[in-house]
Interface confidence: low
């Protein structure tokens, strides 16, 4: 606000006042009179730029008169008091109330003094974010959606991600006249590495004290990615039994594990136990390639591992496996 004047009366008011759609708002307006200055206020007047006539008048002897009595009210002005406070309350803010207003004091002997106030009509948006569940498309697709509904002015949406990708943002009229719904999609090429990771939608709006952060956990459906572990190339005869593990990553979870060899079914010394294959001790060298086939709702994938059980006992009889 401008500082009080030192030699003249000054009308004090903020240059801009925000108000929310449907709510009430006060347009503050005060007459600053220096200590020694004598002045007499005969009338307070509010008008809107571009419109003829006054929307609110408070006359020193006749009191208030409003263009819309149910929507306007002088906050502090009263008959029989010094008219120093012209603050006006507006009820049920509408989009069309946004604009420039003039607050005017008619004083004697100084004449008229006025100030302009810009009323901004805001609407606080509601924000939501949701995952867009996808499969491995091989091309960029939306994986997350962030919607800011019913903002005025439109909310600003940005994304924060360590996964790469790019936003696609659009606007549409909000349900209430003058409001805007902003929809932003986060688009990337889905991969198994993306599944379970998160991106954050940041919504900024001048009605918010601080930006709203909405985190979305991504979902990418993909067939199993399979590997076999548990063999260290140092398996020997006469050792304890060992275990191979079929390691599978997939979404949705694997529904089945099937062990076999390149020659067909499992040999007698190999026993399948779900994701694990138990290798019992053998009495002669073997060279076998094991296959683990993993199935989920999107398909089946397999991994192969060649196991050699060699002659020559290890230094410690601790088992064929280093596990």
């Amino acid at each position: 606000w401008p500082p009080p004047g030192t030699g003249d009366i000054i009308v004090q008011a903020p240059t801009q006042v925000p108000g929310f759609l449907g709510d009430s708002v006060t347009l503050p307006c005060y007459l600053q009179v220096p200590g020694m200055e004598e002045t007499h206020v005969s009338q307070l007047t509010w008008s809107r730029h571009g419109e003829s006539g006054s929307m609110a008048v408070f006359h020193q002897t006749q009191g208030p008169n409003y263009s819309e009595p149910k929507r306007l009210e002088f906050v502090a002005a009263r008959l029989g008091t010094e008219l120093r406070d012209a603050s006006l309350r507006m009820f049920g803010l509408r989009v069309e109330d946004e604009g420039n207003y003039t607050c005017l004091f008619v004083t004697f002997p100084q004449g008229s003094r006025s100030v302009d106030i810009w009323l901004r009509v805001l609407a606080k948006p509601q924000n939501t974010a949701e995952v867009q569940k996808v499969q491995l498309t091989g091309k960029p697709v939306p994986v997350a959606r962030c919607v800011s509904t019913g903002g005025r002015p439109p909310a600003h949406i940005t994304w924060h991600s360590d996964l790469g990708g790019m936003p696609n943002t659009s606007q549409a009229p909000g349900f209430l006249s003058g409001t805007v719904t902003v929809t932003s999609l986060w688009i990337l090429v889905p991969s198994s590495q993306v599944d379970g990771k998160s991106v954050t939608c940041k919504v900024e709006h001048e009605s918010f004290e601080k930006p709203q952060l909405l985190t979305v956990n991504l979902t990418v459906y993909y067939p199993p990615e399979v590997s076999i572990s548990g063999y260290d190339n140092n398996w020997y005869l006469s050792q304890n039994e060992a275990t191979l593990t079929c390691d599978a990553r997939s979404n949705p979870e694997p529904t089945g594990y099937n062990w076999s060899t390149t020659m067909g079914p499992l040999p007698p010394f190999a026993v399948a136990q779900g994701a694990q294959l138990l290798i019992r001790p053998v009495d002669k060298p073997i060279n076998t390639t094991f296959i683990c086939n993993v199935t989920n709702a999107l398909g089946a994938r397999q991994a192969e591992l060649t196991v050699q059980v060699k002659e020559g006992p290890p230094s410690e009889p601790s088992g064929m496996s280093s596990n």
Partner: antibody, heavy 121, light 109 residues
């Protein structure tokens, strides 16, 4: 002239689902809001939800959340309302209504002819 | 849960004036409630008359007007015609949903 033509009457068993269609013509479908409203026998109107055809953005009456899904097919200018887990008290005439714009706000402008859904075992 | 109440029935003479009202159980109706008025004639489709409290839909005769009357929304019919005999529903918006009133059966006789 603006028209909304709805699909024909349906008879369903409790627990089933129903999908009602509403084909629009005579205006730009993607720049419109469509509400779904129902009227049970001898009762007043009950608002179910609205959808913005351009983006598919929806707003559901909480009473129906989880049971109703609204969609649009912009290629055919058709709106759909699917209601699941039907109960006998879902028996009603279901209407789609396009909202018009007056410059100040929206109003229920043009209505479909209604689709009677009967839920009975 | 908001409840919207209308007069169950009203009668008006041809050429007369009648006001239908719409009350909210949550308090005074304001412009934020976006009061809508819808007409249903027997055997015909619904027709939107008024939106946003007082905005007449295109093609609606000027004898229909919407307003706020005290703490209620109102639909005033000035110079009633026989063809205005119908059921009239109001709908109010409560932040995230519309709630319809039970309807007023208007008889012109």
């Amino acid at each position: 002239q603006v028209q909304l033509v709805q699909s024909g009457a349906e008879v369903k068993k409790p627990g089933a689902s129903v999908k009602v269609s509403c084909k629009a013509s005579g205006y730009t479908f993607t720049s419109s809001y469509i509400s779904w409203v129902r009227q049970a026998p001898g009762q007043g109107l009950e608002w179910i939800a609205w959808i913005y055809a351009g983006t598919g953005d929806t707003n559901y009456n909480q009473k129906f959340t989880g049971r109703v899904t609204m969609t649009t097919d912009t290629s055919t200018s058709t709106a759909y309302m699917e209601l699941r887990s039907l109960r006998s008290d879902d028996t009603a005439v279901y209407y789609c209504a396009r909202h018009g714009y007056t410059g100040r706000g929206w109003y229920f402008a043009v209505w479909g002819q209604g689709t009677t859904v009967t839920v009975s075992s | 849960q908001a409840v919207v109440t209308q007069e169950p029935s009203l009668t008006v003479s041809p050429g007369g004036t009648v006001t239908l009202t719409c009350r909210s159980s949550t308090g005074a109706v304001t412009t934020s409630n976006l009061a809508n008025w819808v007409q249903q004639k027997p055997g015909q489709a619904f027709r939107g008359l008024i939106g946003h409290t007082n905005n007449r839909a295109p093609g609606v005769p000027a004898r229909f007007s919407g307003s706020l009357l005290g703490d209620k929304a109102a639909l005033t019919l000035s110079g009633a015609q026989p063809e205005d005999e119908a059921e009239y529903y109001c709908a109010l918006w409560y932040s995230n949903k519309f709630v319809f009133g039970g309807g007023t059966k208007l008889t012109v006789l």
